[in-house]
């Protein structure tokens, strides 16, 4: 049995996968910040997790996916205000009783030290210093991400 949050997450990911291929992104758009091979957009407004997920989707992006602790630290370094929380693309899957990224993968327990409960209707936020489990209905800021396309050096045949 999937929760409404899970259904929304799956629906948005599927609709994103169905959209036509777009040319690779070589530079971050205006107002997006580059972090390694990603462009990040930190919202100024606040929304529940579902609305944040939908907003990133309309921007042809996704809620932030964090690969490892190193990426978490680098992302947190971009957060200017101590007290502000941002949604990322991780929520609790009731059916699998585990934290699940919006791309379908499960959280490696070593990646993030989450403060708070792992239970139904819990979604993950990050601050400058910590990672928190919050009710998904809580209205906070959020981070969208776009992947940058790596530029490959062209190899020219001998002339």
């Amino acid at each position: 049995q999937k929760s409404s949050i899970e259904k929304c997450s799956v629906d948005i990911q599927q609709s994103r996968n169905k959209t036509t291929e777009r040319p690779g992104l070589l530079n971050c758009p205006i107002y997006w910040q580059q972090l390694r091979e990603k462009c990040l957009l930190f919202s100024h407004t606040v929304n529940p997790w579902n609305n944040s997920l939908a907003d990133c989707s309309t921007k042809e992006s996704s809620l932030l996916l964090i690969r490892d602790k190193d990426e978490l630290i680098h992302t947190q370094n971009l957060i200017r205000d101590k007290a502000i929380l941002f949604w990322i693309g991780l929520n609790f899957s009731l059916s699998e009783k585990n934290w699940k990224w919006i791309n379908g993968s499960f959280l490696n327990s070593n990646d993030l030290e989450i403060r708070g409960d792992a239970k139904e209707n819990s979604c993950i936020s990050i601050s400058q210093t910590s990672v928190y489990s919050e009710y998904c209905s809580t209205e906070i800021r959020w981070i969208c991400q776009k992947e940058l396309t790596p530029v490959r050096n062209k190899v020219y045949p001998d002339s």
Epitope: I30, Y31, L41, F42, S43, H44, T45, V46, N47, N51, A54, D55, S57, T58, K59, E60, R80, D81, E139
Partner: antibody
Framework: QVQLQESGPGLVKPSETLSLTCTVS????????WSWIRQPAGKGLEWIGR???????NYNPSLKSRVTMSEDTSNNQFSLKLSSVTAADTAVYYC???????????WGQGTLVTVSS | QSALTQPPSASGSPGQSVTISCTGT?????????VSWYQQHPGKAPKLMIY???KRPSGVPDRFSGSKSGNTASLTVSGLQAEDEADYYC??????????FGGGTKLTVL
């Protein structure tokens, strides 16, 4: 180049509903948020509200009970409705791009709406 | 009555520097780094000059700079030029997705 153009009646009767549309060119309205701002003659600016194309709207608390905003992504337009207008709603109404939800980087040229019988 | 307080007028001679203040509360200016400034010439739409306290959009001369201390934000125009004569408005995010403006300051180049 991003351009915004407001359109709608320049004269509205008291107690009726003011309706304006903003047409955006040079950018997809799906990519940003969009706001309405007004300015009575010789006075300061007042933010009315914003719309996200994901369906969310945020309104100025002082106007919330009278404001409705909607969008038409197929025509790259968004709209404002302000109900139960009075002479105090007479102003130049601007639509603007609201990239992150706290500032406005592209504005329409504005349209004057007069509330009078 | 505007939510943010600006002086009604400011002036300076060409080449001089002028600073316009914008005072709010801890719920708006003091609470967020989301202050912006707009220039408006008579009969024209406002133009964004500064956002996120001190960032300048492309095309805005570096003579315009922004700063913030506590509940007060400031716009400084250095090397004043005749075309800088206009009304200037500050704005701030004010929590729960609200935005507030100042009452405006008329800048006169003497």
């Amino acid at each position: 180049q991003v351009q915004l153009q407001e359109s709608g009646p320049g004269l509205v009767k008291p107690s009726e509903t003011l309706s304006l549309t903003c047409t955006v060119s040079g950018d997809s309205i799906r990519t940003y948020y969009w706001s309405w701002i007004r300015q009575p003659a010789g006075k300061g600016l007042e933010w009315i509200g914003r719309i996200y194309t994901s369906g969310t709207t945020n309104y100025n608390p002082s106007l919330k009970s009278r404001v409705t905003m909607s969008e038409d992504t197929s025509n790259n337009q968004f709209s404002l409705k302000l109900s139960s207008v009075t002479a105090a709603d007479t102003a130049v109404y601007y639509c603007a791009r609201d990239p992150l939800g706290s500032f406005f980087d592209y504005w329409g040229q504005g349209t004057l709406v007069t509330v009078s019988s | 009555q505007s939510a943010l307080t600006q002086p009604p007028s400011a002036s300076g001679s060409p080449g001089q520097s002028v600073t316009i203040s914008c005072t709010g509360t801890s719920s708006d200016v003091g609470g967020y780094n989301y202050v912006s400034w707009y220039q408006q010439h008579p009969g024209k739409a406002p133009k964004l000059m500064i956002y996120e306290v001190s960032k300048r959009p492309s095309g805005v001369p570096d003579r315009f700079s922004g700063s913030k201390s506590g509940n007060t934000a400031s716009l400084t125009v250095s090397g004043l030029q005749a075309e800088d004569e206009a009304d200037y408005y500050c704005s701030s995010y004010a929590g729960i997705n609200n935005v507030v403006f100042g009452g405006g300051t008329k800048l006169t180049v003497l």
